[in-house]
């Protein structure tokens, strides 16, 4: 027993005075507390606790159950123990089947022993199966067995606590060893959508995916720059032993303008955090919005192909589109196709391909298109390059000479006089009168030019070309005539064509 | 008339290449998406790819994202399928298909008559 000096409490003192007491079973346990301060004895085994206020711990016929330690306690809150076995040979294990361990920690299998001379007091795998070759352990017949490093792998070991007595090998009741995973990585977090666009009053409704080893990962949906408690429900599965999955579904009912912004799943454990978040775009009504992909102003040559495209944007997803000319709707050679195949994707490409065209097809192309809440158009003016074409070539009666000529862009008129039979008609004229003439075709169509000059400037037999030229090509027409006596007579104008 | 030939089938190596094309006549060529169509042995019709007219636009199937691509040169009025990484799941009959004007990339009006590409080592 302990000695104290004078003036100091001092610790109870126990008969019999030895640590460890063997008694055999049906036998009786006596055991005295001396104390002037005594208060109680405390018996422990498992989990189990026993009081006792009197100084003498009687117990007539020991069981095994009474195996275990026995404290006594004084005022002063020393204590004394002794640790008494009760040998049983039907009953060699107290035992608490119950088994959890984390994993890289030490879990301990609670078999102690009613008897401490047995020997290769062990563990042993269920039905002759060997343990796993790193699983090590420490045996201590007091307390039972204890794990060293659990590893995730040993999740579901099936063991028992083993001794030899009298040569023979006698195991305990079964134990099955649950692991609890510990964390090696953040979280893993995924939201149903990247963003999310929708008009007000419809319902918002966003679901992140939390995947980790076990339940005990923290989840939560916040809003960013925001401390308000979101509404969320959550539904979660264990697929497998370590592989733990939970959905929380963060709800609107009604979204307003003012709640659009950043949402964010956050997830903790104890390895660290991962989030994701969403943005939501509330609008107030649906919208339209074109950008051409050309000039909306184009020149094509004539029998040349052109396409018109355009981007637009719409919310929500369009619901007509079509391409207009003169107040009919293009049946044909046009397309109108998403921009990508992303489930929030908005925009969306039309392409209209004007092939051959002819001089008579300039003018507006509009491209029309609605959804549920607005309509939208965009308008390209296509004009279409031609080569000047001579309308009309004659000598009116005031003796001037007139020719007139269609094309686009704008012909310019030129004259030249050619004396004599020469082919090369050089010598310019100045007209003298030109006019650009209003077109009774579309304001796309053909620009037309009329210029005149003088023939009583002419006073020699010989030829006038008129020659109309735009940046497409030239066409030219001739006026023959000779003179008899005093007379100009007009000889038939004809054209040349020059491409 | 509206005709449609495919070529360039023919047997390649799992992990080759092929490429094949669609000579196009008896419509202008430029104002049409186009697609291209394949049909495994003993199976239904699998959507491929398909290019908008100006080629402006392309969209693939999941089961060949990343390995094939569509093209088309409209001045020679071909359509072109260059297949990469081949598998023996890609081992089909491709068809070139003409689209119709509007909104549905899924609808066709003529068809060729298709070629054979094996995959097999």
């Known amino acids: 027993q302990p000695s104290v000096s004078p003036g100091e409490p001092s610790p109870p003192s126990i008969h019999p005075g030895k640590s460890d007491l063997i008694v055999r079973v049906g036998d009786e346990i006596r055991l005295l507390c001396t104390d002037p301060g005594f208060v109680k004895w405390t018996f422990e085994i498992l989990d189990e606790t026993n009081e006792n206020k009197q100084n003498e711990w009687i117990t007539e016929k020991a069981e095994a159950t009474n195996t275990g330690k026995y404290t006594c306690t004084n005022k002063h809150g020393l204590s004394n123990s002794i640790y008494v076995f009760v040998r049983d040979p039907a009953k060699l294990f107290l035992v608490d089947r119950s088994l959890y361990g984390k994993e890289d920690n030490d879990t301990l299998v609670r078999c102690p022993l009613t008897d401490p001379e047995v020997t290769n007091y062990s563990l042993k795998g269920c039905q002759g199966k060997p343990l796993p070759k790193d699983l090590r352990f420490i045996p201590d017949p007091k307390a039972g067995i204890m794990i060293k490093s659990v590893k995730r792998a040993y999740h579901r070991l099936c063991l028992h606590c083993s001794v030899d007595q009298e040569g023979k090998s006698v195991l305990s009741e079964k134990f099955i060893l649950k692991v609890r995973p510990a964390f090696k990585a953040v979280p893993v977090v995924s939201v149903s959508k990247a963003s999310y666009l929708l008009r007000e009053g419809e319902e918002f409704t966003v679901t992140c995916t939390i995947k980790d080893v076990s339940s005990s990962v923290y989840s939560t949906w916040k809003r960013e720059n925001s401390q308000t408690k979101l509404q969320e429900k959550y539904n979660s599965w264990h697929h497998g032993d370590f592989n733990y999955e939970r959905q929380a579904t963060l709800t609107i009912s009604s979204a307003r303008v003012n709640d659009s912004g950043v949402f964010m799943c956050y997830a903790n454990n104890t390895f660290g955090s991962a989030n994701v978040t969403t943005t939501l775009e509330v609008v107030d009504k649906g919208f339209i919005n074109i950008f051409p992909m050309i000039n909306t102003t184009v020149f094509v040559n004539d029998g040349e192909n052109v396409d018109l495209i355009v981007e637009y944007e719409a919310f929500p997803k369009p619901e007509h589109q079509q391409w207009i000319y003169m107040n009919r709707t293009f049946t044909d050679k046009w397309e109108d196709y998403p921009k990508s195949e992303n489930e929030s994707n908005i925009r969306y490409v039309s392409e209209l391909h004007l092939t051959r065209l002819k001089g008579t097809e300039g003018g507006t192309y509009t491209f029309l298109v609605s959804n549920s809440d607005v309509n939208a158009a965009i308008a390209f003016n296509v004009y279409v390059n031609t080569k000047p074409e001579i309308l009309t070539y004659d000598r009116l009666v005031n003796g001037m000479l007139q020719c007139v000529a269609a094309g686009f862009p704008e012909p310019t008129i030129d004259w030249y006089f050619c004396p004599g039979t020469e082919q090369r008609c050089s010598a310019s004229v100045l007209p003298v009168d030109v006019q650009t003439l209003n077109s009774s075709g579309p304001p796309f169509g053909k620009l037309v030019v009329q210029s005149s000059i003088d023939s009583s400037a002419f006073k020699h037999n010989g030829t006038v070309e008129c020659k109309a030229y735009n940046d497409v090509g030239k066409t030219s027409a001739y006026f023959n005539f000779a003179f008899k006596g005093n007379n100009k007579e007009q000889i038939h104008p004809h054209t040349l064509f020059t491409p | 008339e509206v005709q449609l030939l495919e070529s360039g089938g023919g047997l390649v190596q799992p992990g080759g290449s092929r490429r094949l094309s669609c000579a196009a006549s008896g419509f202008t060529f430029s104002g049409y998406g186009m697609s291209w169509v394949r049909q495994a042995p003993g199976k239904g019709l699998e959507w491929v790819s398909w290019?908008?007219?100006?080629?402006?636009?392309?969209y693939y199937a999941d089961s060949v994202k990343g390995r094939f691509t569509i093209s088309r040169d409209n001045s020679k009025n071909t359509l072109y399928l260059q297949m990469n990484s081949l598998r023996a799941e890609d081992t089909a009959v491709y068809y070139c298909?003409?689209?119709?004007?509007?909104?549905?990339?899924?609808?066709?009006?003529?068809w060729g008559q298709g070629t054979l590409v094996t995959v097999s080592s």
């Open positions: 298909a003409k689209g119709v004007p509007g909104n549905n990339r899924a609808l066709f009006d003529y």
């Open positions: 290019i908008s007219g100006t080629g402006y636009g392309t």
